[in-house]
């Protein structure tokens, strides 16, 4: 970068090299060139010579002033016009950055995705800081009082093997950058309460010719959790509003869910599950599209994703559920 050049003097920024976006800043350049009394001192930002707001402070120093500086990053350098030199002489350069102090991290969430072997903690970092911001995740056992800290720049995966202090923990997040530091509220967790079942996946759909044609959606999960509650949402692709069916599910076999749908319409389906009575849901599964036939013939749709299932599938049973209307997004 610009900071690696050989300097014949120095360049500095007030109030600092990293500063709050929108501030007024001054960039100073001081020449120190053997037998060169600079006739002029020039400033360049990202290679372009600045023309205004330059003040000569003294024989070897000049100041460039910026009002309301809004660029997240800029490379600055300055040069001197030395007598009897046809080219400007490079004095020094510096990379400058502007941004914001971190917001207080909120919505701290820790979940264990089944089979992952990790506890994944995420949070809402707030507004973009534009500058390097680090997060320290504190995990404190409520049983042993032992505290562990994990440094990251976004979310964190903590191996469940490293959580040796029992089942109950406090988790909080500290955000820090050059402009400030903030700390989240503490989240109390129990490891047994934060497990999210293995992803539920829609594998296929078929519309069966009957007096009233019905569509059967086939879906499954690899979970070993016994009590699982699921939601399936669906809508015509032309609609805004989702319809939601709720199920209490036992994944010892492939699930079949029946829907009575309008003919000759393209529908989209998604499913998600949680351990019954627990807090966190899976994210909604991938979109599964199925177009109902105009008339009699049987239509089968296959999922876009092809998963390999470990269990041999022989018996299929029908599960039905309660139908609701849903405007919710994808928040667990």
């Amino acid at each position: 970068g610009i900071t690696n050049i050989n300097c014949s003097g120095h360049i500095w920024v007030e109030p600092a090299t990293i500063f709050k976006m929108g501030m007024n800043i001054s960039i100073y350049c001081q020449a120190a060139i053997k037998n060169c009394q600079p006739r002029k001192l020039h400033f360049y930002k990202n290679g372009i010579k600045e023309r205004f707001q330059i003040t000569r402070i003294n024989k070897t120093t000049a100041r460039l002033w910026y009002k309301n500086f809004l660029e997240p990053h800029a490379s600055m350098y300055c040069t001197a016009e030395c007598p009897k030199h046809f080219q400007e002489t490079l004095i020094c350069g510096k990379d400058i950055s502007s941004g914001y102090p971190p917001d207080i991290p909120d919505e701290v969430t820790c979940v264990i995705y089944e089979y992952s072997g990790n506890m994944t903690c995420t949070w809402n970092a707030g507004k973009l800081t534009y500058i390097d911001t680090k997060y320290v995740v504190h995990v404190k056992s409520l049983e042993t009082e032992e505290e562990q800290q994990y440094l990251t720049s976004s979310y964190i995966n903590i191996s469940t093997d490293s959580l040796q202090g029992g089942k109950k923990y406090l988790v909080w997040v500290q955000a820090a950058n050059a402009l400030g530091m903030e700390e989240s509220k503490q989240l109390q967790i129990h490891l047994d309460d934060i497990v999210i079942p293995s992803a539920a996946v829609i594998s296929r759909a078929e519309t069966i010719n009957a007096t009233v044609p019905k569509t059967i959606i086939y879906w499954d999960s690899q979970t070993t959790i016994e009590k699982v509650s699921c939601e399936m949402r669906y809508k015509a692709t032309t609609n805004q509003t989702w319809n939601v069916k709720e199920f209490d599910t036992n994944f010892t076999y492939v699930q079949q869910s029946e829907f009575y749908l309008e003919p000759n319409i393209k529908y989209v389906f998604q499913v998600r599950c949680q351990e019954t009575g627990k807090r966190y849901w899976q994210p909604w599964s991938s979109l599964f599209f199925h177009k109902t036939p105009e008339t009699v013939p049987q239509v089968t749709s296959k999922a876009f994703q092809h998963d390999t299932w470990n269990s041999g599938l022989t018996v299929a049973s029908i599960s039905t559920g309660h139908l609701t209307s849903d405007n919710r997004g994808d928040i667990g």
């Epitope: 001081q30 020449a31 120190a32 060139i33 053997k34 037998n35 060169c36 009394q37 600079p38 006739r39 002029k40 000569r56 402070i57 003294n58 024989k59 070897t60 120093t61 030395c82 007598p83 009897k84 030199h85």
Partner: antibody, heavy 117, light 107 residues
């Protein structure tokens, strides 16, 4: 083009002080490094002191360290040389000169200072 | 301090002659050497800077050479207006110092 115009000739008694001015035009004082050089009658050139841009400081020759003061007034674009405790061997022509990449490209016209009782 | 020794201290020459003046520094001054011409009652005038660079406006009969400790000013063909005193000056380190001067006189 730099022009350096010095104040007029002075006659001083031994022990007195003299102040010679050097008015700059064409450039500002902040864009120039002003040095002072003197020449005793029939003798060579002697560097007295001046601004060193590499270290941003005013330097003085050892012989003059205790009694020479170099100042600048950017509001009037005037450099001054004050020499105290004058002796008869301080009789000389005093020049201000603008340093330009290791040489003096621009000189004042010179100021004759005569020290005599 | 760096001592600058010029030789000869004076030289008698005729118009059209080639004149060479040398200047020796008591220690290495790289190429930080200038040559001046001074006429009676006038301020010196720079001829050569950084040992060999000709100052703008100076006739090309003047040339400079050398580096380190030994330097030369050459006037290839002496003209009537060249009769004057010549000084070398080092600018490698402070205090800057001058040679004692070489007077070029009419033979």
């Amino acid at each position: 083009q730099v022009q350096l115009v010095q104040s007029g000739a002075e006659v001083k008694k031994p022990g007195a002080s003299v102040k010679v001015s050097c008015k700059v035009s064409g450039y500002t004082l902040n864009e120039l490094s002003i040095h002072w050089v003197r020449q005793a009658p029939g003798k060579g050139l002697e560097w007295m002191g001046g601004f060193d841009p590499e270290h941003s400081e005013t330097l003085y020759a050892q012989n003059f360290q205790d009694r020479l003061t170099l100042t600048e007034d950017t509001s009037t674009e005037t450099a001054c040389m004050e020499l105290n405790s004058l002796r008869s061997d301080d009789t000389a022509v005093y020049y201000c000169a603008a340093e330009s990449y290791g040489d003096y490209e621009f000189w004042g016209q010179g100021t004759l200072v005569t020290v005599s009782s | 301090d760096i001592q600058m020794t010029q030789s000869p201290s004076s030289v008698s020459a005729s118009v059209g002659d080639r004149v060479t003046i040398t200047c020796r520094a008591s220690q290495d001054i790289s190429s930080w050497l200038a040559w001046y011409q001074q006429k009676p009652g006038k301020a010196p005038k720079v001829l050569i800077y950084t040992a060999s660079s000709l100052q703008s406006g100076v006739p090309s009969r003047f040339s400079g050479s050398g580096s380190g400790t030994d330097f030369t000013l050459t006037i290839s063909s002496l003209q009537p207006e060249d009769f004057a005193t010549y000084y070398c000056q080092q600018a490698n380190s402070h205090p800057w110092t001058f040679g004692q001067g070489t007077k070029v006189e009419i033979k």
